[in-house]
């Protein structure tokens, strides 16, 4: 039974490779999937000597290890590309690295949007 999952309809979208892949660079993505399948948001990034380089953000298809995650938290120690997923609209706005070996928790906040 899937109890009380947060329904994901929209995610923050970002693509660092937007020019080559001919997509938008950033914005919102409306998630679409098959009936009876859950949807998630994700974020992926690199960490080069403490400098965070966003790779992609967007919608993620039904993946059991993403179920019931309210926050986007990556736990791998030192991957080439960090990955996290979560459930709930725009839950991938902030993302966190919480290494399994018990290192410091690092949360990445989106830059404040400039007033229009």
């Amino acid at each position: 039974s899937g109890r009380g999952e947060a329904e994901t309809r929209e995610c923050i979208y970002y693509n660092a490779n937007w020019e080559l892949e001919r997509t938008n660079q950033s914005g919102l993505e409306r998630c679409e999937g098959e009936q009876d399948k859950r949807l998630h948001c994700y974020a992926s990034w690199r960490n080069s000597s403490g400098t965070i380089e966003l790779v992609k953000k967007g919608c993620w298809l039904d993946d059991f290890n993403c179920y019931d995650r309210q926050e986007c938290v990556a736990t791998e120690e030192n991957p080439q590309v960090y990955f996290c997923c979560c459930e709930g609209n725009f839950c991938n706005e902030r993302f966190t690295h919480l290494p399994e070996a018990g290192g410091p928790e690092v949360t990445y906040e989106p830059p404040p949007t400039a007033p229009t």
Epitope: D63, F64, N65, Y67, D68, T75, C85, L98, E100
Partner: antibody, heavy 118, light 111 residues
């Protein structure tokens, strides 16, 4: 090093109950979905049940629905499978497995044997 | 009820190439089912070989590769060795928490 250690198997009469445990170490248990998979003697692998990181979502194969209950205690790093109304066809080695992104089983325990016989 | 099908048995000569397949009764296998492959020798726990269609698990030699062939998932072993003689299982993730195993393929390495 990731370790999954199942226990609680044994011989039980038809209609009886058992509770299997899987003690996890070497990874952040509360951050991993988990699953139970079984293998009857001389047969193939069969997915039995899965539970999300919080325990809020649980799923079962049709043949065990209403008889088996999967649960987890994240403070004890332990996964459980409560098996009631056991039948001869539930006789199998039961494995616990860690579920990773892309919904695959990245680590397996060594298994515990459940025998249902009178 | 979803049934995932694999060849019951297969033989390969040492050094040869073999492709095992994994299909199901209600359509074509695609990457959205996250096909994964596992190797099991008698009396042992399964070992993860391939996940997400074609990604090798850590420590798995590059003789093992995964793909989609037509409407099925496939596991190819190139340069087969004696210790590749095992049972091989595919798993498809159907969504909504449900995983389905194939019936398994018993691979024999001749000679």
């Amino acid at each position: 090093e990731v370790q999954l250690l199942e226990s609680g198997g044994g011989l039980v009469q038809p209609g009886g109950s058992l509770r299997l445990s899987c003690a996890a170490s070497g990874f952040t248990f509360r951050n991993s979905a988990m699953s139970w998979v079984r293998q009857a003697p001389g047969k193939g692998l069969e997915w039995v049940s899965a539970i999300s990181v919080t325990g809020g979502s649980t799923y079962y194969t049709d043949s065990v629905k209403g008889r088996f209950t999967v649960s987890r205690d994240n403070s004890r790093n332990t996964l459980y499978l409560q098996m009631n109304s056991l039948r001869a066809e539930d006789t199998a080695v039961y494995y616990c497995a860690k579920v990773y992104y892309y919904s695959f089983f990245d680590y397996w325990g060594q298994g515990t044997l459940v025998t249902v016989s009178s | 009820q979803t049934v995932v099908t694999q060849e019951p048995s297969f033989s390969v000569s040492p050094g040869g190439t073999v492709t095992l397949t994994c299909g199901f009764n209600s359509g074509s296998v695609s990457t959205s089912y996250y096909p994964s492959w596992y190797q099991q020798t008698p009396g042992q726990a399964p070992r993860t070989l391939i996940y997400n269609t074609n990604t090798r698990s850590s420590g798995v030699p590059d003789r093992f590769s995964g793909s989609i062939l037509g409407n099925k998932a496939a596991l190819t072993i190139t340069g087969a060795q004696a210790d590749d003689e095992s049972d091989y299982y595919c798993v498809l993730y159907m969504g909504s928490g449900i995983h389905v195993f194939g019936g398994g393929t018993k691979l024999t390495v001749l000679g």
